[in-house]
Amino acid sequence: SYSMEHFRWGKPVGKKRRPVKVYPNGAEDESAEAFPLEF
């Protein structure tokens, strides 16, 4: 667990959110890609 000094602006410093979702195919697209292949 995180002690208080690990929090800044209310979020755990070490916890990383997922990448922003990608909506690649124009106005009609409802699919999202968040995790591209690693190279």
């Epitope: 755990p12 990448p19 990608v22 909506y23 690649p24 124009g26 106005a27 409802e30 292949l37």
Partner: antibody, heavy 110, light 112 residues
């Protein structure tokens, strides 16, 4: 699906201003949204974002200067205490995509 | 925060030529890198995401490469319509101390 910003106007320094991004054709409960700005003749600058679940993150320079919140169809960007350096066109963007609004111009001047 | 450094600031090439734009991230962003094209008075247009995947309707003359911290955008067979400013964008996840969404400073492409 469309995205449109509104609320941009001429304000004096220190006067809070809230910009609204209104979306149609999709629900914000399923999409990540980013606020980006562009000063006249300058490059793109990411201010902050709100994830589909409502979690918000801000660029370091933007913390304490902006707040982002949302409903099911709108995303608000509040400029807490505008300075002349906040003069820019503000864009709302659906994640990484071609869903950018046309932008709304904020001018901060005394 | 992730800082994106883009070079050059401006580049000029002839119709039919090739230009390469470089983008460097201050920390590894895996392949969470997009490229946008912006023309005056318009919002940016998505060209490439996941570092190398072309967005819908983008011609294959645009090629993105790279991963980690080093990325490039190459535009071949330049057309007059390619004259624009190009931006790289990281979209890695954020944490409480590091914001993962950042743009490069932009590269103006001038087509002669």
């Amino acid at each position: 699906q469309s995205v449109k910003e509104s609320g941009g106007r001429l304000v004096t320094p220190g006067t809070p201003l809230t910009l609204t991004c209104t979306v149609s054709g999709f629900s914000l409960s399923n999409y990540d949204m980013i606020w980006v700005r562009q000063a006249p003749g300058k490059g793109l600058e990411s201010i902050g974002m709100i994830y589909d679940d409502g979690d918000t993150y801000y660029a370091s320079w933007a913390k304490g200067r902006f707040t982002i919140s949302k409903t099911s169809t709108t995303v608000d960007l509040k400029i807490i205490s505008p300075t002349t350096e906040d003069t820019a066109t503000y864009f709302c963007v659906k994640g990484v995509s071609n869903h950018w609004g046309p932008g709304t111009l904020v001018t901060v001047s005394s | 925060d992730v800082v994106m450094t883009q070079t050059p600031a401006s580049v000029e090439a002839a119709v039919g030529g090739t230009v390469t734009i470089k983008c460097q991230a201050s920390q590894s962003i895996s392949s969470y890198l997009a490229w946008y094209q912006q023309k005056p008075g318009q919002p940016p247009k998505l060209l490439i995401y996941s570092a190398s995947t072309l967005a819908s309707g983008v011609p294959s003359r645009f090629k993105g490469r790279g991963s980690g911290t080093e990325f490039t955008l190459t535009i071949s067979d330049l057309e007059c319509a390619d004259a624009a400013t190009y931006y790289c964008q990281s979209y890695d996840g954020s944490s409480g101390s590091s914001y993962g969404v950042g743009f490069g400073g932009g590269t103006e492409v001038v087509v002669k």
